[in-house]
């Protein structure tokens, strides 16, 4: 079957990294600089992605594979394939329209990206707070209050209702 297909379509013989050149009797020509073909039998090569500015090159373009970009230090990727870069914040912060802001009391963020999330409400699971939460860390829930010695406290502050964080606009 492969041989039959080759006889019918000479382009099917062109490997990745080349294209079937209609201008030259359908011979296989190498992809020009800054282009690639990742599969065989292609009639054109695709332009390489360019990583500039806030993007940096994670993987160089080759004749058989596209370039891959990520973000420069201090930024993280958004979108599949890193189509946008967003500023990092510190742990215990979130990115708002006005820049990086500390998490409100009762919320935390243990990453450099994303929004501050409410501490776990241990009492909802019938447990008590073993370790208090901080801006950077969630509370650690321990045994249920009934398991504690008399007089032990298990006050969990209510998680405030809040809007999701915003990227700067």
């Amino acid at each position: 079957f492969e041989r039959t297909r080759s006889l019918q379509d000479p382009c099917s013989n062109c490997p990745a990294g080349t294209f079937c050149d209609n201008n030259r009797n359908q011979i296989c020509s190498p992809c020009p600089p800054n282009s690639f073909s990742s599969a065989g039998g292609q009639r054109t090569c695709d332009i390489c992605r360019q990583c500039k500015g806030v993007f940096r090159t994670r993987k160089e373009c080759s004749s058989t594979s596209n370039a891959e970009c990520d973000c420069t230090p201090g930024f993280h990727c958004l979108g599949a394939g890193c189509s946008m870069c967003e500023q990092d914040c510190k742990q215990g912060q979130e990115l708002t329209k006005k820049g990086c802001k500390d998490c409100c009391f009762g919320t935390f963020n243990d990453q450099k990206r994303g929004i501050c999330r409410p501490w776990t409400n241990c009492s909802l699971d019938g447990k008590s707070v073993l370790v208090n939460g901080t801006k950077e860390r969630d509370v650690v829930c321990g045994p249920s209050p009934a398991d504690l010695s008399p007089g032990a406290s298990s006050v969990t502050p209510p998680a405030p209702a809040r809007e999701p964080g915003h990227s700067p606009q």
Partner: antibody, heavy 115, light 107 residues
Amino acid sequence: QVQLQESGPGLVKPSETLSLTCTVSGFSLTTYGVHWIRQPPGKGLEWIGAIWSGGSTDYNAAFISRVTISVDTSKNQFSLKLSSVTAADTAVYYCARDDGSFANWGQGTLVTVSS
Amino acid sequence: DIQMTQSPSSLSASVGDRVTITCKASENVGTYVSWYQQKPGKAPKLLIYGASNRYTGVPSRFSGSGSGTDFTLTISSLQPEDFATYYCGQTYSYPLTFGQGTRLEIK
């Protein structure tokens, strides 16, 4: 809050040099670059060029012989210079922060080229 | 340069309608396409990045799809504030290029 604001003369004579500034606040010029994009009246958007956070530049080949983009970090300003202007350069000129997808733009400034 | 061709160039629709705008790239640009909304006298506003990601604060009635050379912006139920001009743009390769725009008018 991230803000960009273009400013400069609204009227430039043919053959002269168009000079615009983009004053920014809410972000560091050493962290982000800026793009310049223009829009002739009633037409689409055209990318002119960009200056990256390290100070290097990239220009659209259509403008390369007459465009210069620079930065003055002490004034929190980027600048665009376009020489030998003609009526075809009449447009609203925008600066936009470099984040990969143009999430933050200035309000734009109209430049008319006329004698 | 990569050409971005939008269609239609203008479109009349009513509040509540579902509207689709298409953008065709002259080369494969992966998913590196953004969509912008522009109202008269204002700067463009980012709606969609990476072909399908809604930017912060953009209503869920706006959605984007596509990859390679064919892309669409869909507004599921038009609101009065959606009447504007929409542009696609590719952020894949330099020079960055934009479509010629689609003007969305009230029928």
